[in-house]
C-alpha cells in the first residue's frame, strides 16, 4: 500500500503520500481554531505508471493507453485513498467546543 | 456536475471530462476483442482551483492551502467520479462471449 509507513521511509518517485504540514492561520486563514495550531495533512504526488496501485479498471486502461501514447495528456493521477479525521478545539465565546473533522489527513494514495 | 453534458458543450478550462477515443488494438494492444473495435473512454483534465467540485474536506483544505501557497506542488487533482461499464464481445474458440467490463467509461470528474 502507498501509505505513510512505506512512503515516508522510502525515496519512492512514483505516486506516494508525501509529508505536508498545514498551519491553520498562515496557510488557510482560519484564525479561530484554538488547538491544534496546525496539523500533518500530507498530500499525494508522483507519476502513475502502468500497474502502479491502479484504482479501477479504467485507470488500468488509461495507464496502458499512456504506455502506448507517451505524449498524451490523458494519464491517471495520484490522489488520496485513505483519509483520517482530525479533532479540533475552538471557542464559542468563553466556551470550548471540540469537533471531529472528517477526511482531513491523508494516510495513503492511489492512482485514479 | 462536471459531466459529459456540461463539459462536452463548454470550453471549460478547469477540471472537466474530456473526449478520448481508445482503439483496443492500437492503443492497448488488445487484439482479441472482437466488438467494439474501440470506445469513448474519456478522461479528466484541468486545474482544480478553490471551490471547483471538491470531493472531500481534505480537498477543500488542499485547494485553500494552494490559494495561500500558489507555488506549492500540493494541489487537488482532476480524476474520474462517475464511471460506466462497457459491453464487449470476444471469441473463445468459435464461441462468442459477451462480457460487461465495469468502470470503463468516464461520465464525470471531481477534484480529489
Amino acid at each position: 500500500a502507498l501509505d505513510t509507513n512505506y512512503c515516508f521511509s522510502s525515496t519512492e518517485k512514483n505516486c506516494c503520500v508525501r509529508q505536508l504540514y498545514i498551519d491553520f492561520r498562515k496557510d488557510l486563514g482560519w484564525k479561530w481554531i484554538h488547538e491544534p495550531k496546525g496539523y500533518h495533512a500530507n498530500f499525494c504526488l508522483g507519476p502513475c505508471p502502468y500497474i502502479w496501485s491502479l484504482d479501477t479498471q479504467y485507470s488500468k486502461v488509461l495507464a496502458l493507453y499512456n504506455q502506448h501514447n507517451p505524449g498524451a495528456s490523458a494519464a491517471p493521477c495520484c490522489v488520496p485513498q485513505a483519509l483520517e479525521p482530525l479533532p479540533i478545539v475552538y471557542y464559542v465565546g468563553r466556551k470550548p467546543k471540540v469537533e471531529q473533522l472528517s477526511n482531513m489527513i491523508v494516510r495513503s494514495c492511489k492512482c485514479s | 456536475a462536471l459531466d459529459t453534458n456540461y463539459c462536452f458543450s463548454s470550453t471549460e478550462k478547469n477540471c472537466c471530462v474530456r473526449q478520448l477515443y481508445i482503439d483496443f488494438r492500437k492503443d492497448l494492444g488488445w487484439k482479441w476483442i472482437h466488438e467494439p473495435k474501440g470506445y469513448h473512454a474519456n478522461f479528466c483534465l484541468g486545474p482544480c482551483p478553490y471551490i471547483w467540485s471538491l470531493d472531500t474536506q481534505y480537498s477543500k483544505v488542499l485547494a485553500l492551502y494552494n490559494q495561500h501557497n500558489p507555488g506549492a506542488s500540493a494541489a487537488p487533482c482532476c480524476v474520474p467520479q462517475a464511471l460506466e461499464p462497457l459491453p464487449i464481445v470476444y471469441y473463445v474458440g468459435r464461441k462468442p462471449k459477451v462480457e460487461q467490463l465495469s468502470n470503463m467509461i468516464v461520465r464525470s470528474c471531481k477534484c480529489s
Partner: antibody, heavy 121, light 107 residues
Framework: EVQLVQSGAEVKKPGASVKVSCKTS????????MNWVRQAPGAGLDWMGQ????????NYNEMFEGRVTLTADTSTSTAYMELSSLRAGDIAVYYC??????????????WGQGTLVTVSS | DIVMTQTPPSLSVSPRETASISCRAS??????????MHWYLQKPGQSPQLLIY???NLESGVSDRFSGSGSGTDFTLRISRVEANDTGVYYC?????????FGQGTK
C-alpha cells in the same frame, strides 16, 4: 469587492417554513463564519446563529428553539437559513453577515441587504 | 446570557458637536486581554455597518471622527464633529459569551 446578496421578500402562512439564501462573492467563502441576524419591525438586532461553510459546523441561539437550520453550499458560495413553524412574531428582516474572522463568535464586517419575511394567514 | 443596555435610547445632536453613547454589559466582556465589544451604525433603510472592533479599533474605511473606549462592563462610542450623514441607530454588540448579543440601540 465583498458582496452578500440575499434572496427576495417572502410571504408565508403560519406554521410554514421559509428558506432565505445569501450568495457571496469577493472573498473565500470557506474562510469565514457566516452569521444570521434578524430585526423585527422597529426593533433591535437578534443573533440567530452561525455556520462555518467549510464543513458545516453550526452554533445556534437557543432562543430559536431548534426552529432554525443553517446550511451552506461551497460549490456556489451560498449560505442558507431555514426557519420552520413560522408565527406572527417571526415577521422581520433577516440578514446574513460575515464574521470578522478572528473568532467563531465575532463582530460582523459585511452584511447582506436583508430579506423581509412576512407571516400572514 | 449577557444583556447589553444602551443609553440614551435616543439623542439629538447639532452639526459639528460631539455625541456620546454608552453601553453597559450585565457582566464583564473582557477575556485574554481583549474587550469583546463592537459598535455598528444602521442608517435608515440600510443594513448595519461595523464602526469599531474590540472596543477601540476603528474599522477600515470608517471616518476617524468615530472612536470607542472602555473595558469590563462599561463602554462608550464618541462621534466628534457630527454630520447629518451620521443619522441612524447605533448598536453595541458583545461576543465574549454565547449567545452573541446586541444592545437595544440608540437613535
Amino acid at each position: 469587492e465583498v458582496q452578500l446578496v440575499q434572496s427576495g421578500a417572502e410571504v408565508k402562512k403560519p406554521g410554514a417554513s421559509v428558506k432565505v439564501s445569501c450568495k457571496t462573492s469577493g472573498y473565500i467563502f470557506i474562510t469565514y463564519w457566516m452569521n444570521w441576524v434578524r430585526q423585527a419591525p422597529g426593533a433591535g438586532l437578534d443573533w440567530m446563529g452561525q455556520i462555518f461553510p467549510a464543513w458545516g459546523s453550526t452554533n445556534y441561539n437557543e432562543m430559536f428553539e431548534g426552529r432554525v437550520t443553517l446550511t451552506a453550499d461551497t460549490s456556489t458560495s451560498t449560505a442558507y437559513m431555514e426557519l420552520s413553524s413560522l408565527r406572527a412574531g417571526d415577521i422581520a428582516v433577516y440578514y446574513c453577515a460575515r464574521g470578522y474572522g478572528n473568532y467563531a463568535l465575532d463582530a460582523m464586517d459585511y452584511w447582506g441587504q436583508g430579506t423581509l419575511v412576512t407571516v400572514s394567514s | 446570557d449577557i444583556v447589553m443596555t444602551q443609553t440614551p435610547p435616543s439623542l439629538s445632536v447639532s452639526p459639528r458637536e460631539t455625541a456620546s453613547i454608552s453601553c453597559r454589559a450585565s457582566e464583564s466582556v473582557d477575556s485574554y486581554g481583549n474587550s469583546f465589544m463592537h459598535w455598528y451604525l444602521q442608517k435608515p433603510g440600510q443594513s448595519p455597518q461595523l464602526l469599531i472592533y474590540l472596543a477601540s479599533n476603528l474599522e477600515s474605511g470608517v471616518s476617524d471622527r468615530f472612536s470607542g473606549s472602555g473595558s469590563g462592563t462599561d463602554f462608550t462610542l464618541r462621534i466628534s464633529r457630527v454630520e447629518a450623514n451620521d443619522t441612524g441607530v447605533y448598536y453595541c454588540q458583545q461576543n465574549d459569551e454565547d449567545p452573541l448579543s446586541f444592545g437595544q440601540g440608540t437613535k
